[in-house]
Interface confidence: low
């Protein structure tokens, strides 16, 4: 777009005719206070397109901003509209005038507010008085824009001088609204019902003497209006409260209840909705996912949660192997369902100081008329490792073996490892490790048996050993999911002492 | 805490229409001009459309000028964009701003440093 004069401020002779031309290669308009006025518009023989926009005897009021832009919007960019903005310095003319709205300026928190008064001639002073103060305010001006800065609760005025009168602006009125001056809370008994049942909401609105209560419900949208019931709590002052009955909820019920109050004394006012789900019949539905697997580790205390959504309020059964469970009076198994939330639940089992024998298939049960689930999962007890034996032995061959057993759930897992340095291991030399299948000097064999009733894995290792020609430290290392245990034995040459 | 939310987002063919939702809690909502932005990938954030807090006056980005609609509902706290004609330029996450400033020239709105609260973003795709 081409403008001409370029602007972007122009300085225009009161009475006086000026043109503005604007040319680009699709339709040009130019537009003033969001309206178009009346332009020549054109397009030239090599296909570029102009309007041109005559003022005629200017005024004060002409002052303002003139915008060149597009005449449509098709694949051109936003940046394709160029300001102008035109100053008509006119001695009849004090402030340009404002709408109304422009005149009351209201905030909700201190942020920065322009107040709009502009003059005609650029190179007036202008200067910002509270409405009954004489002294100019620090404030920065614009004189495209007007005032801008944070500004109190206060009634504002402009004031400049015209020859030799002074010419005030019309009053600002800036308002920080106080939100917390009317404060309103909606409740309902319940926010899930069944159809048949009841809906009842309460709005509630505290420190005012006159409000005025208005609700919106999906059933006012179909012409089914319910009348409210509005009282005041007498115990505690300034609590008025009104009251939605909606008997027997149908389907169409559910939706959006909005409680708008109104105080009419400082215009405040404030909403509050809230969502009533009306259901065909009840539900529980599992939230979340339990794994058909879960562990606790012996000797410890493991919770076991099952979080779900019911409606009407279920009972909950724990079971065992079949077997119901209940609270124990030995104070080894702890049964709570805590309701979180109108219809969400969530439910524990807590095994206090696990023994081998709280393993096995748990099953909870969550049960109403309406509706039942039930989630199962196999809880595996845990146990640390532990080596219970490493032992070293001459067996006739020549060969030297260690023999390393250990017990462990989940199964354990064994590293073997060396050390000939006896005075700088383990601290300044790594161990090495000892049983790779390539190692011609030592051989592993490692059998591995679950033990049923203690519901538990035993790993037996022995490690063969070649030729031993100095002392040597070995070491056998168990390690499963919840703890490693080492033990460590030195082999000595058959010539030498045995020592462990 | 004031939150804007916005969502109708979504994937849609050139020359379709999208309606985009901004719900506003935590602030006190007719006294905000609102405003719609966009940010397209390895852009600028950029003005697309604002609704005055008083009148409800409108004020649009040329490129979307005649084919989106900005309008409130000061009930239920929720600005507006009906988005028609859609192109495949219009792709871009589209942000609901809230501002308490007043200016008298609407054209200050195109400033993203004049709004006081910011939604997430909604995905806006317009395939061709």
């Known amino acids: 777009l081409v403008v001409t004069p370029p602007g972007p401020e122009l300085v225009l002779n009161v009475s006086s005719t000026f043109v503005l031309t604007c040319s680009g290669s699709a339709p040009v308009v130019w537009e003033r206070m969001s309206q178009e006025p009346p332009q020549e518009m054109a397009k030239a023989q090599d296909g570029t397109f102009s309007s041109v926009l005559t003022l005629t005897n200017l005024t004060g009021l002409d002052t303002g901003e003139y915008f060149c832009t597009h005449n449509d919007s098709r694949g051109l960019e936003t940046d394709e509209r160029k300001r102008l903005y035109i100053f008509v310095p006119d001695p009849t003319v004090g402030f340009l005038p404002n709408d109304a709205e422009e005149l009351f300026i209201f905030l909700t928190e201190i942020t920065e507010i322009t107040i709009p008064c502009r003059v005609t001639d650029p190179q007036l002073v202008v200067t910002l008085h509270e409405k009954k103060g004489d002294v100019a305010l620090p404030v920065p001006y614009d004189h495209q824009r007007g005032f801008s800065g944070i500004f109190e609760d206060r009634s504002y005025i402009c004031k400049t001088t015209i020859g030799d009168r002074e010419v005030d602006s019309d009053a600002y009125y800036v308002y920080r609204l106080q939100v917390s001056s009317i404060n309103v809370s909606v409740n309902a008994v319940q926010t899930v019902v069944r159809q048949g049942e009841n809906i009842t909401l309460m709005c509630i609105v505290i420190g005012n003497e006159v409000v005025n209560f208005e609700w919106t419900y999906p059933r006012k949208e179909s012409g089914r209006l319910v009348e409210p019931v509005t009282d005041f709590l007498l115990d505690m002052p300034y609590h008025i409260r009104s009251i939605l009955h909606i008997p027997s909820a149908e389907l169409e019920d559910s939706g959006t209840y909005t409680c708008n109050v109104t105080e009419s004394v400082n215009d405040h006012q404030d909403e509050k909705a809230i969502n009533i789900t009306v259901v065909e019949s009840g539900y529980v539905r599992l939230l979340g996912e339990v794994g058909t697997l879960q562990f606790a580790e012996l000797h410890r205390s493991r919770t076991l949660q099952v979080v779900f959504e019911a409606y009407p309020p279920p009972t909950v059964l724990w079971f065992k192997d079949n077997r119901t469970l209940g609270d124990s009076s030995a104070g080894e198994i702890a049964l709570s369902t805590r309701n979180v939330s109108e219809t969400r639940y969530v439910s524990e089992l807590t095994l206090v100081r696990v023994k081998v024998a709280e393993a096995g298939h748990y099953t909870m049960r969550a049960f109403h008329e309406d509706a039942e689930v039930q989630l199962s999962f196999q809880l595996q007890i845990n146990v640390p490792v532990r080596v219970l034996e490493l032992s070293e032995s001459h067996p006739d061959s020549g060969e030297q073996t260690v023999r390393c057993r250990g017990r462990g759930m989940p199964q354990p897992n064994i590293i073997w490892s060396a050390c000939r340095d006896l005075k700088r291991c383990p601290r300044e030399l790594p161990p090495t490790l000892l049983g790779n299948s390539s190692e011609e000097e030592s051989q592993l064999e490692t059998n591995v048996t679950y033990w049923e009733e203690e519901q538990e894995f035993e790993v037996v290792s022995t490690l063969r050993l070649q030729h031993v020609d100095r002392p040597l430290s070995v070491r056998c290392t168990l390690r499963n999911a919840v703890g490693q245990d080492t033990q460590e034995v030195i082999v000595v040459p058959h010539s030498l002492p045995f020592k462990v | 805490e004031v939150q804007l939310v916005e969502s109708g987002g979504g994937l849609v063919q050139a020359g379709g229409s999208l309606r985009l939702s901004c719900a506003a809690s935590g602030l006190f909502f007719s006294f905000y001009n609102m405003g719609w932005f966009r940010q397209a990938p390895g852009k600028e954030r950029e003005f697309v459309a604002i609704?005055?807090?008083?009148?409800?006056?409108?004020y649009y980005a040329d490129s979307v000028k005649g084919r989106f609609t900005i309008s409130r509902d000061n009930a239920k706290n929720t600005v507006y964009l009906q988005m028609d004609s859609l192109k495949p330029e219009d792709t871009a996450v589209y942000y609901c701003a809230a501002a308490s400033s007043y200016y008298s020239d609407s054209y200050y709105y195109t400033r993203s440093d004049k709004y006081n609260y910011w939604g997430q973003g909604t995905q806006v795709t317009v395939s061709s």
């Open positions: 609704i005055r807090k008083t009148g409800g006056s409108t």
